[in-house]
């Protein structure tokens, strides 16, 4: 990352103006943003959200931490070991494996800030990479050479 | 989000202690973190990263913004309109569609902070939801009822 100047306001600025604005821009809800309410089974549906129509279907599991931003993260959990047949949407095709796709997401943790003499002076945000599973993907198995 | 107290340090705290720590924890590199160097073609490889072994293969496109955290985001771009056959990994099966999976990711933008009289007083972080495409997924086409 390139260096950013300190994001803190200048000395003496009134801290009632919160540095980090929590309001979000209005964005239409997107499929992976919340768990789906379709029946969780190893089948590829012909309607509903992407994770239930996929031939490597998955469900979402909530991971909530009130000291983290974002506070709510969702982890994908595969519903089948193999891919579902495109022909029937219900039988498994063992020629394909359903594998989790992982991603290191940037998150921020609220940590106590310490003053000059180690005293507690409000809160700081600490950036971390956090491993999340995004989706299940149908792949051809690796060929061992 | 539950309300967090102001993340700014108390009045008079030395702002040389940067509020947001940029250092990251060491995390093993994961496949989707960077674009793959495999040939970009509509085929499911038998080796390499997940995005090239998928029967809905995709490439990554860099989206860099130095005034945003994370500064680097990757958008998935599907390499095939349909899924690739599990039989061969190199010919398409029109019974399946390769569709992008979208996600609203929390990002932070650096914005000028304004003091009591509208004067520029350092920088603030503003939270936004940013739409990213995470992967391409092989799905059964929607049946229109």
């Amino acid at each position: 990352y390139s260096h950013w100047p300190s994001c803190c306001p200048s000395k003496g600025q009134d801290t009632s103006e919160e540095l980090l604005r929590w309001s979000t821009v209005p964005v239409p809800p997107l499929e992976p943003a919340r768990p789906n309410r379709h029946p969780e089974s190893c089948r590829a549906s012909e309607d509903g959200p992407l994770n239930s129509r996929a031939i490597s279907p998955w469900r979402y599991e909530l991971d909530r931490d009130l000291n983290r931003l974002p506070q709510d993260l969702y982890h994908a959990r595969c519903l089948c070991p193999h891919c579902v047949s495109l022909q029937t949407g219900s039988h498994m095709d063992p020629r394909g494996n359903s594998e989790l796709l992982y991603h290191n997401q940037t998150v921020f943790y609220r940590r106590p800030c310490h003053g000059e003499k180690g005293t507690h002076k409000g809160y700081c945000l600490e950036r971390r990479l956090y491993r999340v599973s995004l989706a299940c993907v149908c792949v051809r198995p690796r060929v061992m050479g | 989000y539950s309300h967090w107290p102001s993340c700014c340090p108390s009045k008079g705290q030395d702002t040389s202690e940067e509020l947001l720590r940029w250092s990251t924890v060491p995390v093993p590199p994961l496949e989707p973190a960077r674009p793959n160097r495999h040939p970009e073609s509509c085929r499911a490889s038998e080796d390499g990263p997940l995005n090239s072994r998928a029967i809905s293969p995709w490439r990554y496109e860099l989206d860099r913004d130095l005034n945003r955290l994370p500064q680097d985001l990757y958008h998935a771009r599907c390499l095939c309109p349909h899924c690739v056959s599990l039989q061969t990994g190199s010919h398409m099966d029109p019974r399946g569609n390769s569709e992008l999976l979208y996600h609203n990711q929390t990002v932070f933008y650096r914005r000028p902070c304004h003091g009591e009289k509208g004067t520029h007083k350092g920088y603030c972080l503003e939270r936004r939801l940013y739409r990213v495409s995470l992967a391409c997924v092989c799905v059964r086409p929607r049946v229109m009822g």
């Epitope: 047949s85 022909q87 029937t88 219900s90 039988h91 498994m92 095709d93 063992p94 020629r95 | 509509c42 085929r43 056959s85 599990l86 039989q87 061969t88 990994g89 190199s90 010919h91 398409m92 099966d93 029109p94 019974r95």
Partner: antibody, heavy 123, light 113 residues
Framework: QVQLQESGPGLVKSSETLSLTCTVS????????WSWIRQPPGKGLEWIGF???????NYNPSLKSRVTFSVDTSKNHFSLKLNSVTATDTAVYYC?????????????????WGQGTLVTVSS | DIVMTQSPDSLAVSLGERATINCKSS????????????LTWYQQKPGQPPKLLIY???IRESGVPDRFSGSGSGTDFTLTISSLQAEDVALYFC?????????FGPGTKVDIK
């Protein structure tokens, strides 16, 4: 009636490149998948790979690093190049057409074969 | 890769008698969604290319005499010649087309006793 005919040199020097062409007559090369298969003298059959008229290929991993297929729809033929040959590449080389199952969108068995051409690798 | 094995390596059968060739795949080649076995049988006579006899394990190719039949499912398959004729003397191969790389059995040589 679809007919396939292999052509190319019958003798290739060790470490050089084996080049063969399969000419298709009695039907179009388009819309089908075309394979190369070889058979060492007195032995079994080995699938080398296939090519589609669009140029999409699939190679046997055992030969992938040395093999290249190409197709010329205007001449209704497809070709094989196998580089860095050794004596173990001595074989009868066949070209064949895959049956294509439009119900499953999958490749079936080989329904038409060429007569085959013997390629000997000499040291 | 899927390994195909055949037994016996060779067999000699009297004219008009039954000949049975077995083929085994190292993994299941039945796809339950279509209930199809991705197995085919070829006949090869000396100096000729292989000729397609049976596909989907049991479907006879057009023009193939009905004395040839295929059976089996999953990993175990059989080619049967119900009444051996002189023109059936040949090498017989099984092949899987379930997944690439497509692989062949080593062959079974059929002779007349």
């Amino acid at each position: 009636q679809v007919q396939l005919q292999e052509s190319g040199p019958g003798l290739v020097k060790s470490s050089e490149t084996l080049s063969l062409t399969c000419t298709v007559s009695g039907g179009s090369i388009s819309s089908y998948y075309w394979s190369w298969i070889r058979q060492p003298p007195g032995k079994g059959l080995e699938w080398i790979g296939f090519i589609y008229y669009s140029g999409s290929t699939n190679y046997n991993p055992s030969l992938k690093s040395r093999v290249t297929f190409s197709v010329d729809t205007s001449k209704n033929h497809f070709s094989l190049k196998l580089n860095s040959v050794t004596a173990t590449d001595t074989a009868v080389y066949y070209c064949a057409r895959h049956y294509f199952d439009s119900g499953t969108y999958e490749l079936g068995p080989f329904d038409y074969w060429g007569q085959g051409t013997l390629v000997t690798v000499s040291s | 890769d899927i390994v195909m094995t055949q037994s016996p390596d060779s067999l000699a059968v009297s004219l008009g008698e039954r000949a049975t060739i077995n083929c085994k795949s190292s993994q299941n080649i039945l796809l339950t969604s279509s209930n199809k076995n991705y197995l085919t049988w070829y006949q090869q006579k000396p100096g000729q290319p292989p000729k397609l006899l049976i596909y989907w394990a049991s479907i006879r190719e057009s023009g193939v005499p009905d004395r040839f039949s295929g059976s089996g499912s999953g990993t175990d398959f059989t080619l049967t010649i119900s009444s051996l004729q002189a023109e059936d003397v040949a090498l017989y191969f099984c092949q899987q087309y379930y997944i690439t790389p497509f692989t062949f059995g080593p062959g079974t040589k059929v002779d007349i006793k």
